[in-house]
């Protein structure tokens, strides 16, 4: 069964800066990745970035530097200040559309006890949804 993992890390140098990494553990080819915050897309979440292997990348503030890390994982930096800044309990979700598996989504947030600069290892997040 395919899985999606989400890792959220707060940067030690900037406490309002977060790095989100997501990956797809499956054999299919990825056709689209959507990153959102505040919950899943379509369920009260806000699209932060969309990444397509051929058509490129779009991102919306406070997202910066969305990029492919590998063919099956992506990363994204959030630089926030004021109202647009993410907080420690913000939920981030990644949805991977792949062929032939379909769409798989997982969400994660900063581990509650983590210090800046530290993060939990990238494990499959508890919220998992297949369309």
């Amino acid at each position: 069964t395919p899985e999606v993992w989400v890792q959220v890390r707060m940067e030690a140098t900037e406490l309002s800066s977060f790095t989100i990494r997501c990956g797809f553990l499956g054999s299919g080819s990825i056709s689209l990745v959507t990153v959102s915050w505040g919950g899943p897309n379509g369920a009260g979440g806000t699209t932060l970035a969309v990444l397509h292997p051929e058509r490129g990348i779009r991102q919306w503030a406070p997202a910066r530097q969305a990029r492919w890390e590998t063919q099956s994982s992506i990363s994204l930096i959030l630089e926030g200040s004021g109202a647009s800044s993410p907080c420690a309990n913000t939920t981030f979700c990644c949805k991977f559309a792949s062929f032939p598996e379909g769409s798989w989504e997982a969400c994660g947030s900063l581990p509650p006890s983590s210090d800046p600069g530290l993060s939990a290892p990238p494990t499959p997040a508890p919220i998992l949804r297949a369309d």
Partner: antibody, heavy 119, light 106 residues
């Protein structure tokens, strides 16, 4: 087909407020950012801000913070822009525009709403 | 904030000819530039995004290129319906429009 239909022209007095609407059809309203753009007579285009209808998340151009307030009504797939404390500098045509994501920014536009501020 | 300097502000060209408009950003915009056509009394129309990607239904007479801070937009084989004002837009970091270029036919 995708359409954005804006409300009609407005003539208002200085100091008053006005609410402009932009009704979307032909796509999933909650999946795409709606942007607002100002164009003064004979001038260029200025980005005011955006709202993501799926979550009500807003982001404003610093210049328009306190001047514009963006909201949506999901049930009617309509975006609104409230402009307050109006002066003659606010007289302009205001456009709403959908951000198409990978299809391109501002890929569909409303027809524009003309606002005239005059006593 | 990223500033966009668009030039020229106006130009005149002959039917069948070619024109080129340039936009210079105050910093690298990673190819995130779009070009719009606006006719009097109408909303703008997206022609090109991501520097050179033509929107569906837009004739191949329109083209875009560039990298880093510099971008250009060209129309070849000018036709009467190309009379309009053209704007660039950077969307790498929020949104900033260029000042516009008014195209007239000689």
């Amino acid at each position: 087909q995708v359409q954005l239909q804006q409300s009609g022209p407005e003539l208002v007095k200085p100091g008053a407020s006005v609410k402009i609407s932009c009704r979307s059809s032909g796509y999933t309203f909650t999946d795409y950012y709606i942007n607002w753009v100002k164009q003064r007579p004979g001038q260029g285009l200025e980005w005011i801000g955006w709202i993501f209808p799926g979550s009500d998340y807003t982001y404003y151009n610093e210049k328009f913070k306190g001047k514009a307030t963006l909201t949506v009504d999901k049930s009617s797939t309509t975006a609104y822009m409230l402009l307050s404390s109006l002066t003659s500098e606010d007289s302009a045509v205001y456009f709403c525009a959908r951000d198409g994501g990978l299809r391109g920014p501002f890929d569909y536009w409303g027809q524009g709403t003309t606002l005239t501020v005059s006593s | 904030d990223i500033q966009m300097t668009q030039s020229p502000s106006s130009l005149s060209a002959s039917l069948g000819g070619k024109v080129t408009i340039t936009c210079k950003a105050s910093q690298d915009i990673n190819k995130y530039i779009a070009w719009y056509q606006q006719k009097p009394g109408k909303g703008p129309r997206l022609l090109i995004h991501y520097t050179s990607t033509l929107q569906p239904g837009i004739p191949s007479r329109f083209s875009g290129s560039g990298s880093g801070r510099n971008s250009s937009f060209s129309i070849s084989n000018l036709e009467p319906e190309d009379i309009a004002t053209y704007y660039c837009l950077q969307y790498d970091n929020l949104h900033t429009f260029g000042g516009g270029t008014k195209l007239e036919i000689k």
